[in-house]
């Protein structure tokens, strides 16, 4: 199947990277992260129509079965294909530390 | 956050491995796969409530932002954490071949 990148539902409606501005309060991190206090969270949002950014053969199968049995099998879902690391400076018992999280910000998206 | 395995929505309602019986016609493979003629497709289906089988910190963030902005940010989604390989015997121009697909059958599930 073609790993399509053109959204048949119209511009911006299909699975893609979105940026959501969030405070540490929003994220539930206010009591342990010192910097940054606000984050540009990149995440994968949007519909996964047939053949759009299919991650693998499992996604193809899922779409075919969803069309046959929509009440049983959900459509593929828009999730991160890879991540960008994020650096947080956080409170510790002894002071502060620099910590990198590799699985926090979506880098690009696909349908699974 | 606790990588919870107990479903707060009731037994079988949360993200887990399901088996769906499918024919090659269902999968759209009838014209190129010789064997097997029917497949027990394992896939990930179910809801992803807070702290249930969270794959990573991205899933935690997504859930927190979903609670704050449900119209903008969707809940985490139930997808394969790993796959089982599957062997297909398929038609080729010169006859038949044995091919292993590594990304076809879900092995276990998590919420992203």
């Amino acid at each position: 199947a073609r790993n399509g990148d053109r959204c048949p539902l119209g511009p911006g409606r299909c699975c893609r990277l979105h940026t959501v501005h969030a405070s540490l309060e929003d994220l539930g991190w206010a009591d342990w992260v010192l910097s940054p206090r606000e984050v540009q969270v990149t995440m994968c949002i949007g519909a996964c129509p047939s053949q759009f950014r299919e991650a693998n053969m499992h996604a193809q199968i899922k779409m075919n079965l969803h069309r046959l049995k929509p009440d049983t099998v959900p459509a593929p879902c828009c999730v991160p294909a890879s991540y960008n690391p994020m650096v947080l400076i956080q409170k510790t018992d002894t002071g502060v530390s620099l910590q990198t999280y590799d699985d926090l910000l979506a880098k690009d998206c696909h349908c699974v | 956050a606790r990588n919870g395995d107990r479903c707060p929505l009731g037994p079988g309602r949360c993200c887990r491995l399901h088996t769906v019986h499918a024919s090659l016609e269902d999968l759209g493979w009838a014209d190129w796969v010789l064997s097997p003629r029917e497949v027990q497709v394992t896939m990930c289906i179910g809801a992803c409530p807070s702290q249930f089988r969270e794959a990573n910190m991205h899933a935690q963030i997504k859930m927190n932002l979903h609670r704050l902005k449900p119209d903008t940010v969707p809940a985490p989604c139930c997808v394969p954490a790993s796959y089982n390989p599957m062997v297909l015997i398929q038609k080729t121009d010169t006859g038949v071949s044995l091919q292993t697909y590594d990304d076809l059958l879900a092995k276990d599930c998590h919420c992203v």
Epitope: E38, P85, I89, V96, L98 | -
Partner: antibody, heavy 118, light 107 residues
């Protein structure tokens, strides 16, 4: 856009102290920490330490511990770096650098030359 | 502390040629590495972060690669404005440390 504007050049005698300021604009000041980095003439870059503009928590390079103090004033969106007991090898350009969520930073002040000479 | 070692100290390249700069860490820094360009009298300019992600506005001729302890900055076709000093920086642990720099000069 993000801007970091530092105070002007200083000439100091050995044993004296210097206080360099860094005024930030174009973002919410207490949302990011400030690093201080220095560069001796013709030399490489040396990290001096970091301060949280939100809480005032600090982390200093071990070799400067006891001689350096970093502070912030959120009312004026300004960060300060004070270095005491100056020596000739403290002669350098001092930069303030804003944190980012990705690690590396595109946000540097223009630099302040501090000359220590008798 | 993590020691960052850059090589060569000086690289002589003709405009239009490819330049390859190396940076080695004394212990693994994962992908927590940035590259900066500095011209005389200016503050350093961020080129690459996360070992391979180009910063906003940085031309595609700059690319970074590597992880762990070995990293490379490649300038595919040197322009006149690229002659400068380049520094690598690790931000895996405090203290943050920089390499000694590589001066890219006109051959």
């Amino acid at each position: 856009q993000v801007q970091l504007v530092q105070s002007g050049a200083e000439v100091k005698k050995p044993g004296a102290s210097v206080k360099v300021s860094c005024k930030a604009s174009g973002y919410t000041f207490d949302s990011y920490g400030i690093n201080w980095v220095r560069q001796a003439p013709g030399q490489g870059l040396e990290w001096m330490g970091w301060i949280s503009a939100y809480s005032g928590d600090t982390a200093y390079a071990q070799e400067l511990q006891g001689r350096v103090t970093m502070t912030t004033d959120t009312s004026t969106s300004t960060a300060y770096m004070e270095l005491r007991s100056l020596r000739s090898d403290d002669t350098a350009v001092y930069y303030c650098v804003r944190d980012t969520q990705y690690g590396g930073s595109p946000y540097w002040g223009q630099g302040t030359l501090v000359t220590v000479s008798s | 502390e993590i020691v960052m070692t850059q090589s060569p100290a000086t690289l002589s390249v003709s405009p239009g040629e490819r330049a390859t700069l190396s940076c080695r860490a004394s212990q693994s820094v994962s992908s927590n590495l940035a590259w900066y360009q500095q011209k005389p009298g200016q503050a350093p300019r961020l080129l690459i972060y996360g070992a391979s992600t180009r910063a906003t506005g940085i031309p595609a001729r700059f690319s970074g690669s590597g992880s762990g302890t070995e990293f490379t900055l490649t300038i595919s076709s040197l322009q006149s404005e690229d002659f400068a000093v380049y520094y690598c920086q690790q931000y895996n642990n405090w203290p943050i440390t920089f390499g000694g720099g590589t001066k890219v000069e006109i051959k």
